[in-house]
């Protein structure tokens, strides 16, 4: 029988009677089968941390801090459930740490040096770690202790409960520099008084702060935001424009045998019977002897963190930023305007050599980070091990979501000025052999299908889409008989047709040889009714373009095209005859790499792009013998977006509509956890 | 294609010094870049130094000031001189010319280092 117990971690005698009290009455409305909770005490949170790695406890909350503590080796632990503030409707489980400026005041977060600050308080999340470790290379040197350090770089601070004798300057705008209330200028809405009062220059409070201080729009239009890429904001768009996006309260549990379903189920249930306004005699989110005692007072409710996200994901670049930069104290010698290498992400081993020979031509410019599949790549961008790759629309749109931007285009048609001409786009289209003559776009159903990958633009999001328009359902793997789209679980359907041999079957990479443009027109020309690819797919490898045994001999004549109104056509008509129009492939980075990730990559393609005309002899960085390794291999050159530099400018209302549609259907564990973060 | 072989390999305490060789079939002048690969048991393959045609060299950060590529266009060879040897170092090293294009899953015998007092 599995042990359904979870053992709660306490961290003081109030949280212990708390949780005693939680358990037995927890047995009273949960069957003998059903989860049920015990109690481990324990002196401090760090000593909870401790207990569940030892598998001696299993759950505890901890703010965003802990969370960073619990995640460090060796504890390993990571988030499974959030505490939510505010609605069910509107669930709150993250707050924005902001720096707010007067409106007129005209300096960006570059040139906060000799500024005047206010924070809520020394320690504290928004009104200190989180500015000062984002700032931390920025002090001047010796940067401990830390307090020097800042009291050097303003000209003068509201600094609440710093030492004032030490570091008079963290004071001088709030003598004494009080601990409570009793310091007009203590706390989120007394450190924007500070501000407000003209004390200040800038703020560092959470996003709730200013509407909390000011219910008339009129007067919060007076103030602005300071973003991380020295650019400013209006107040309302915090979620564009902040210096960290922070977890409120988080329940944490071991990554591996962790039992965070068993946590979910308990927590899931015990909401619905003590949670907010459920019962009289026991309430999770109340503290009769106390304040926060096992969960916070505030909370309305949990939310299940998706399993996807790990603690690094959760907290966000930003803050682990922050914290590390306080914790570890290290920065690169000398911050110089030079930029870093930049860390492309490549896809398993072909990907990775050819990044390596990159690596070595750019001379130390570029540096490569391996992955197994797309979203992993993401993942590594998101939290810093990456910096930037080249995607496919439908990742561009995942991308989009979890945080990053694009920051150059893939162009395929050549022109006098390529860099500066973004296209607008290739064609989407479905491939079948002109010797199936019968099979129309209107009969696909039972057929042999072949996608380029899960997620991708031309080979799923576009079809797929379309399809779901007409069957209402995301059962694709009933619809086709059998296909190979990798990336699909691997029983499904969908994995059949595919030819990875042993763990590579039906993998979104080239490890599995029915992936991508080349491997899913490879999947319909040996063994399936319909390839979902783009318009040059055919031409690319038809004709004696592709050497490889199994294409050396293809015809582009034997190949033709289905069109939406059930009619077909030979594959050169493909501006008449396709089913969508996709954006290009994109490079995407995160918002603090944009402009290094320009700068390297146009200088990498003056050396290594289109002009070189010898690829058997030297370096060419968008080619790869119709294997689409780093670039697609039809790429001219990378175009700047001017101002198409959003994803949801990138891709077009219409498709991320289209995307959007599908997301009923999305499989994409990464979307899960990014749309978590932000909704 | 370019055949190649590793040779050099060998036992050494740590502080020493190994010189490795990769002797090409064919002519390696036309090859754009070369490169020297290793790993160490249990683990992937990773990227030591490469050299391009012109002689430009990038090396892996742990290896940098320790070890030095460079190729004889001549001799149709590449070598790897290894000096100041730690025991991470001990692992099988391969060579590769980059112009089989990246995805073939071909690799040498490779040449054995152990780094061990």
């Known amino acids: 029988v599995p042990d359904k117990t979870v053992r709660w971690c306490a961290v003081s005698e109030h949280e212990a009677t708390k949780c005693q009290s939680f358990r037995d009455h927890m047995k009273s409305v949960i069957p003998s089968d059903g989860p049920s909770v015990a109690c481990v005490k324990k002196a401090s949170y760090l000593d909870c941390i401790r207990a569940i790695a030892a598998n001696e406890a299993d759950a505890v909350t901890l703010d965003a801090g802990l969370v960073y503590d619990a995640y460090l080796a060796p504890n390993n632990l990571k988030p499974v459930v959030a505490e939510f503030y505010g609605s069910k409707e509107d669930p709150q489980t993250f707050y924005y740490a902001v720096a707010v400026v007067k409106k007129d005041s005209g300096f960006q977060m570059n040139q906060l040096r000799g500024k005047k600050s206010c924070h809520t308080g020394l320690g504290r999340s928004a009104g200190w770690n989180i500015p000062i470790g984002l700032l931390y290379c920025d002090l001047p040197e010796p940067r401990k202790p830390l307090e020097k350090a800042v009291a050097n770089f303003f000209s003068g601070s509201c600094a609440p409960c710093a030492d004032g004798t030490d570091f008079p300057q963290l004071c001088q705008l709030c003598p004494g520099c009080g601990c409570s209330t009793l310091n007009q200028y203590f706390g989120y809405s007394g450190a924007f008084k500070c501000l407000k009062d003209g004390a200040g220059d800038v703020a560092f409070v959470k996003h709730s702060t200013i509407f909390e201080n000011l219910a008339n729009k009129a007067d919060r239009d007076q103030y602005e935001l300071l973003c991380l890429d020295n650019t400013r904001k209006p107040v309302d768009e915090y979620k564009d424009c902040h210096l960290a996006q922070v977890p409120s309260h988080t329940v944490v549990a071991r990554s591996m045998g962790g039992k965070e379903d068993l946590i979910w189920e308990l927590l899931n249930q015990a909401q619905e019977h003590f949670g907010k306004d459920k019962s009289k005699e026991f309430q999770l989110f109340s503290s009769p002897h106390g304040k926060d005692l096992l969960f916070k007072d505030s909370a309305h409710g949990f939310l299940k963190v998706p399993p996807r996200m790990d603690a690094k994901m959760y907290l966000g670049y930003e803050y682990v930023t922050a914290i590390r930069n306080l914790r570890e104290g290290t920065c690169p010698e000398a911050p110089t305007d030079e930029c870093k290498p930049v860390k492309w992400c490549a896809l398993s081993h072909h990907e990775r050599l050819k990044c390596d020979e990159w690596s070595v031509n750019s001379v130390g410019k570029i540096e490569c980070v391996s992955a197994e599949t797309t979203e992993d790549c993401i993942a590594k961008i998101m939290n810093g091990e990456a910096d930037a790759m080249s995607l496919d629309g439908g990742f561009v749109y995942i991308a989009g979501k979890c945080g990053l931007v694009p920051v150059l285009a893939e162009n395929y048609n050549k022109s006098d000025n390529c860099e500066d001409t973004p296209e607008a786009g290739y064609f989407a289209i479905a491939v079948v052999k002109k010797s199936a003559s019968d099979l129309t776009w209107d009969n696909l159903k039972g057929k042999k299908s072949c996608h380029t990958a899960v997620g991708r633009t031309a080979g799923w999001n576009i079809p797929m889409g379309l399809l779901y328009n007409k069957i209402n359902h995301c059962r694709f793997d009933e619809f086709f008989s059998e296909g190979c789209a990798p990336g699909s679980k691997k029983d499904s359907s969908l994995c059949k047709l595919c030819m990875g041999s042993g763990l590579n079957l039906c993998e979104p990479n080239n490890k599995e040889g029915y992936y991508g443009y080349t491997g899913a027109f490879r999947c319909l020309v040996e063994k399936g009714d319909v390839a979902f690819v783009k318009h040059q797919t055919v031409p690319q490898n038809t004709g004696g373009k592709n050497p490889d045994p199994w294409a050396k001999n293809l015809n582009e004549k034997d190949y033709e095209l289905l069109c939406l109104d059930g009619t077909r056509k030979p594959v050169e008509e493909y501006a008449n005859c396709h089913l969508a129009r996709a954006p290009n492939h994109a490079v995407v980075t995160r918002k603090d790499k944009e402009a290094c990730v320009h700068k390297i990559l146009r200088q990498q393609q003056h050396l290594f792009g289109s002009n070189v005309t010898d690829c058997s002899g030297n370096f060419c960085l968008f080619r790869s013998e119709t294997k689409d390794l780093l670039f697609r291999d039809d790429t001219v050159c990378l175009a700047k977006l001017h101002d198409r530099n959003t994803y949801e400018k990138y891709l077009g209302e219409e498709y991320v509509k289209a995307v959007g549609n599908l997301r009923k259907c999305s499989t994409s564990s990464l979307l899960e956890a990014c749309t978590f973060r932000r909704p | 294609e370019v055949q190649l072989v590793e040779s050099g390999g060998g036992l050494v305490q740590p502080g020493g010094s190994l010189r490795l060789s990769c002797a090409a079939s064919?002519?390696?002048?036309?090859?754009?870049?070369m490169a020297w690969y290793r790993q160490a048991p249990g683990k992937g393959l990773e990227l030591v130094a490469g050299i391009t045609r012109s002689g430009s060299t990038n090396y892996r950060d742990s290896v940098k000031g320790r070890f030095t590529i460079s190729r004889d266009n001549s001799k149709n060879t590449m070598y790897l001189q290894m000096n100041s040897l730690r025991a991470e170092d001990t692992a099988v090293y391969y060579c590769t010319d980059y112009s089989s294009r990246y995805y073939h899953d071909y690799w040498g015998q490779g040449t054995l280092v152990t780094v061990s007092s």
């Open positions: 064919g002519s390696i002048f036309s090859i754009a870049t």
